[in-house]
Interface confidence: low
């Protein structure tokens, strides 16, 4: 389905509003430090050019690829070398190398200030004064901080952002209406960004076979009534969509995502009974709804898997004829029967099954060799079950903040070389698994917990790749996607680590502590906890708990004092000395 002008084709398919939004997202994800106004100017220039191509597809340059057009536009930025350094060298390359070069320079942890939320009246005035600019600013600010955010989904977030302001800026109590909605969008947005980052890492680091295996397992759980051929078609289409978005081809990605939603809604009967309410919604909402749809009910009469995958004498013949198809069918059959398993566990089982067939199909008596293959699955299944059980018990015993602290200590002891901000961020997010998953019924706990942990650990891997400091982290991150979480779980105290020298400055606090939000206070305390463990990796839980209780009491006391700064100056050194003594 070739078009004389790719840019005209996408403009017509997507419409001007979505076209402009997606180009802004693409440019903001590539040039993360550029000012907003610069990006708006570039987007307007590209849009005007696209309109000339819609009017005449034979016009000059309209036949160029989108990468060529967008890359040429990005390379017109005057301050490219001063702002981005070696990224400017990308502009000397030809496509497709130039786009690959831009992709490699995407920064998962850009040095950008945290977004500060203005007063509600200020936001409402800005929204009313210029709604279009207000919404573009939202797309720009999110995209530059999250360079792999799933672009068509970001348009959906922007639509919800707009709806929140449209409703709440007219409400009697604007803040009560708006702030919870903005909090929800922020939290959902961070989760969406992290989930997409794992998809892109899966594709970029482990290839489309790894992504397709993930998609087969997940879609088979969601659509257990669908035939294998139907699931395979959805997997192929979904892989194309995510490959495009992860590769910066946002217009193609959004267009193909819309086509996939259309296909699913036209073929509900052969996919799932749960799609109906999604399919009545407008495009952005529909695509989001389909992506989040709950698992359909399992067919009642599914036969045992053993007949086809263990007992049959044709297992090796079927495997040899088409290995990936046979393994894909195994994964499909196993996953549709087990919505209670995490996707990562299902992939481990498929890997174990593949390894057994590789070994046994070359043996003298293959059937005898693979007859007990399902028994070998038991420890693989029990490991995440036990992990979830133990950690949910710990979460229920400690509550979220102290559970996060337990994880901070655990992970700092495992990989003390990792930077303190990274350990705090990752451990805080690991700790959120408790509130997210432990309240769920037993059958939903493992898929919730382990697949969430995979997303959080991917963040650790992505940040660590930018600044590698630990061979153990590199090993867990690169050896096997599906075994990342078990690999990190298995790490013990790093005996080779040389403890960090004590630095009193790290434990010096001031009266500004008292004006911090509860979350910011927690982060400060957790930062100190990580530094303590780096200084004394063999400290016991009791010792660390004691120092942290002492710290909380010290901060509480000084924040209640009349002269707070004097209190911190006087009590701080005492706290440091007492802590050192306690950990000696």
């Amino acid at each position: 389905d070739t078009h004389k002008s790719e840019v005209a084709h996408r403009f017509k398919d997507l419409g001007e509003e979505h076209f402009k939004g997606l180009v802004l997202v693409a440019f903001s994800q590539y040039l993360q430090q550029c000012p907003f106004e610069e990006h708006v100017k570039l987007v307007n220039e590209v849009t005007e050019f696209a309109k000339t191509c819609v009017a005449d597809e034979s016009a000059e340059n309209c036949d160029k690829s989108l990468h060529t057009l967008f890359g040429d536009k990005l390379c017109t930025v005057a301050t490219l070398r001063e702002t981005y350094g070696e990224m400017a060298d990308c502009c000397a390359k030809q496509e497709p190398e130039r786009n690959e070069c831009f992709l490699q320079h995407k920064d998962d942890n850009p040095n950008l200030p945290p977004l500060v939320r203005p007063e509600v009246d200020v936001m409402c005035t800005a929204f009313h004064d210029n709604e279009a600019t207000f919404l573009k600013k939202y797309l720009y600010e999110v995209a530059r901080r999250h360079p792999y955010f799933y672009a068509p989904e970001l348009l959906f977030f922007a639509a919800r952002y707009k709806a929140a302001f449209a409703e709440c800026c007219q409400a009697a109590d604007k803040a009560a209406c708006l702030l919870p909605k903005l909090d929800e969008l922020r939290d959902e947005g961070k989760a969406s960004s992290a989930k997409q980052r794992l998809k892109c890492a899966s594709l970029q680091k482990f290839g489309d076979r790894a992504f397709k295996a993930w998609a087969v397992a997940r879609l088979s759980q969601k659509f257990p009534k669908a035939e294998f051929a139907e699931v395979s078609k959805l997997v192929t289409d979904l892989t194309k969509v995510h490959t495009e978005c992860c590769h910066g081809d946002l217009l193609e990605c959004a267009d193909d995502r819309a086509d996939l939603a259309k296909y699913m809604c036209e073929n509900q009967d052969s996919i799932s009974s749960k799609l109906k309410e999604c399919c009545d919604k407008p495009l952005l909402e529909k695509s989001h709804c389909l992506a989040e749809v709950e698992n359909d009910e399992m067919p009642a009469d599914l036969p045992s898997l053993a007949a086809d995958y263990v007992e049959s004498k044709d297992v090796c013949k079927n495997y040899a004829e088409a290995k990936d198809v046979f393994l894909g069918m195994f994964l499909y059959e196993y996953a549709r029967r087990h919505p209670d398993y995490s996707v990562m566990l299902l992939l481990r089982l498929a890997k174990a099954y593949e390894a057994t067939l590789e070994k046994c199909c070359a043996a003298a008596d293959p059937h005898e060799c693979y007859a007990k293959v399902f028994d070998e699955f038991q420890p693989l299944v029990e490991e995440p079950q036990n992990l979830v059980k133990q950690n949910c018990e710990l979460f229920e015993q400690l509550g979220e903040y102290k559970f996060q602290n337990a994880l901070l200590v655990r992970y700092t002891k495992k990989v003390p070389q990792v930077s303190t901000p990274t350990l705090v961020e990752v451990s805080r997010n690991l700790g959120k698994v408790g509130a997210k998953c432990c309240k769920l019924p037993e059958a939903k706990r493992m898929p919730c917990a382990e697949d969430y942990l995979s997303v959080v650990l991917n963040r650790l891997c992505v940040l660590h790749e930018k600044t590698p400091v630990s061979e153990k982290v590199t090993k867990c991150c690169t050896e096997s996607l599906v075994n990342r979480r078990p690999c990190f779980s298995a790490l013990e105290l790093d005996e080779a680590y040389v403890p960090k020298a004590f630095n009193a400055e790290t434990f010096t606090f001031h009266a500004d502590m008292c004006t911090l939000s509860e979350k910011e206070k927690q982060v400060k305390k957790q930062t100190a906890l990580v530094e303590l463990v780096k200084h004394k990796p063999k400290a016991t839980k009791e010792q660390l708990k004691g120092v942290m209780d002492n710290f909380a009491a010290f901060v509480e006391k000084c924040c209640k004092a009349d002269d707070k700064e004097a209190c911190f100056a006087e009590e701080g050194p005492k706290f440091v000395a007492a802590s050192q003594a306690a950990l000696a």
Epitope: E542, K545, G546, V547, D549, N550, A553, K557, A578, S579, A581, A582
Partner: nanobody, 115 residues
């Protein structure tokens, strides 16, 4: 090691007063901080009051102005004077002590506020 033994708990009417004591023995020369905590049935243990060797004190808002912590170093005893008691003060009250934080705990004494 430090041993702590609480006493003074009992039944009291709302608005009434009670004085708890905690006798410390063992390696008490290392004790810098002493505190009272309480735990109501089915609830988390809650901090009530703390006093340092130098005599500085702190309290949560829930008891401030009603409860007073004090210690007699010569008798190795910690006290908690509780006035204007309320039904929600019903709990087992624990004495705790330690050199840097409260790492030694007593067995607790029950306080019931009820009419």
């Amino acid at each position: 090691q430090v041993q702590l033994v609480e006493s003074g708990g009992g039944l009291v009417q709302p608005g009434g007063s009670l004085r708890l004591s905690c006798a410390a023995s063992g390696s008490i020369e290392s004790i810098n901080r002493m505190a009272w905590y309480r735990q109501a049935p089915g609830q988390q243990r809650e901090f009530v009051a703390r006093i340092s060797k130098g005599g500085s004190t702190n309290y949560p808002d829930s008891v401030k102005g009603r409860f007073t912590i004090s210690r007699d170093n010569s008798k190795n005893t910690l006290y908690l004077q509780m006035n204007s008691l309320r039904a929600e003060d019903t709990a087992v009250y624990y004495c705790a002590a330690g050199p840097v934080w409260e790492q030694f705990w007593g067995q607790g004494t029950l306080v019931t506020v009820s009419s």
